[in-house]
């Protein structure tokens, strides 16, 4: 034991992340100690493999100790990057473990669970269209377009609640092609077109 040697301590802990599939990401970790500690990452109790183990890996252990993802990998079933991570710094005097950091993957599927259907109403009658957007994380918000332009939801006749578009009192000018739009940090998805026909 050399007098100036000391055990590791974490000086920068990783933070929770939410990242879009396919995007790069970094979980930070910095440790002090003498001798300089080695850093390893663990996810759910298992050691995370990096480019140090397999040069084809999409995860890189940076000289600072941070874990860099060239792209976040996330499939329909296999989800190797999502989870709770810790970094562990070690030297011969001991080890230090960082705080937990969760890495969540933002996704937005392609397929609408329910596409809106064509509606035919008489002038003055209420009209309702309904859609269920694709599954996503974070949960997608829903908006509507009419004839390719965002719907004017300042019109007090129009209410958007959940996946429902309600027009309490239809006018001839409400007729047109409607599309439901699901949006989150990944991007947006548009439903199939539904036609609203307003009969005189």
């Amino acid at each position: 034991l050399r007098q100036e040697d000391f055990p590791p301590r974490i000086v920068e802990h990783p933070s929770d992340l939410i990242v879009s599939k396919g995007e790069p990401a970094t979980l930070n970790c910095k440790a002090e100690g003498r001798p300089t500690p080695t850093i390893e990452w663990y996810k759910g109790g298992e050691r995370v493999e990096t480019d140090k183990d397999d040069p084809r890996s999409h995860r890189m252990l940076l000289p600072s100790g941070s874990l860099f993802f060239l792209r976040i990998v996330h499939g329909r079933k296999s989800r190797p990057d999502e989870g709770v991570y810790v970094c562990v710094a070690r030297n011969y005097l001991g080890e230090a473990v960082s705080h937990n950091a969760s890495l969540e993957v933002a996704i937005l599927r392609d397929d609408f669970r329910q596409n809106p259907s064509d509606v035919m109403v008489a002038v003055g009658e209420p009209a309702v269209m309904e859609c269920q957007p694709p599954r996503g994380h974070p949960e997608p918000t829903i908006s509507w377009k009419k004839d390719g332009s965002p719907l004017d939801d300042k019109d007090e006749r129009i209410t958007i609640r959940g996946g429902k578009l309600m027009i309490t009192y239809t006018r001839k000018s409400d007729a047109g092609k409607y599309v439901c739009v699901g949006t989150n940090m990944v991007g947006e998805r548009e439903s199939e077109v539904a036609e609203l026909t307003v009969l005189e």
Epitope: E46, D53, R76, K77, S78, R79, P80, D81, G83, D111
Partner: antibody, heavy 118, light 105 residues
Framework: EVQLVQSGAEVKKPGASVKVSCKAS????????MHWVRQAPGQGLEWMGW????????EFPQKFQGRVTMTRDTSITTAYMDLSRLRSDDTAVYYC???????????WGQGTMVTVSS | DIVMTQSPSSLSASVGDRVTITCRAS??????LNWYQQKPGKAPKLLIY???SLQYGVPSRFSGSGSGTDFTLTISSLQPEDFATYYC???????FGGGTKVEIK
């Protein structure tokens, strides 16, 4: 190195069972689904099902339900496929394959030849 | 069940030829389509994932295209080591095409 190493060839009698193992190394075992695929002599590839090593959840096509069992031992990063009530047409090479986060089978075992003969 | 139909089932070609193999799904599978190469006595090898993405280490003469129900694998200039059997696979619910054997003319 990321690899899947399977158990050796088996010869079984009709009506018996066979258990094939697939040892994973070089990656986080619980992060990737494991599939089993078989190939009869001179034939194409046939999917037999998957196991999620994280929780042991499984799914099989109708054809194999009730006859195939898939298990895993996370402590030794090994997946197993058990096929019961063997028939001569189960003679095939059986492969384990890792499903990547890109929804494709990126790593395959070397295959295990199972011969069913009386 | 989603049925994958590959064509042709076999073809003869010469080194340097451009080779095209098609795969049709019985219903839309978006871009959940992968291509594999298999040589006798060996395990299949992933070539293309997500319809058009080239797997790490695979030569750029291999390319994939298509979405929905119709997909294509193209080998721009056939090399001696490319004589093998090729399989498409849909990962929407998982099933394989019947295979295409590429033989020397």
């Amino acid at each position: 190195e990321v690899q899947l190493v399977q158990s050796g060839a088996e010869v079984k009698k009709p009506g018996a069972s066979v258990k094939v193992s697939c040892k994973a190394s070089g990656y986080t075992f619980t992060g990737y689904y494991m599939h089993w695929v078989r190939q009869a002599p001179g034939q194409g590839l046939e999917w037999m099902g998957w196991i999620n090593p994280k929780d042991g959840d499984t799914e099989f096509p109708q054809k194999f339900q009730g006859r195939v069992t898939m298990t895993r031992d996370t402590s030794i990063t090994t997946a197993y496929m058990d096929l019961s009530r063997l028939r001569s047409d189960d003679t095939a090479v059986y492969y384990c394959a890792r499903e990547s986060g890109d929804d494709a089978f990126d790593i395959w075992g070397q295959g295990t030849m199972v011969t069913v003969s009386s | 069940d989603i049925v994958m139909t590959q064509s042709p089932s076999s073809l003869s070609a010469s080194v340097g030829d451009r080779v095209t193999i098609t795969c049709r799904a019985s219903q839309s599978i978006s871009s959940y389509l992968n291509w594999y190469q298999q040589k006798p006595g060996k395990a299949p090898k992933l070539l293309i994932y997500a319809a058009s993405s080239l797997q790490y280490g695979v030569p750029s003469r291999f390319s994939g295209s298509g979405s929905g129900t119709d997909f294509t694998l193209t080998i721009s200039s056939l090399q001696p080591e490319d004589f093998a059997t090729y399989y498409c696979q849909q990962s929407y619910s998982t099933s394989f095409g019947g295979g295409t054997k590429v033989e020397i003319k």
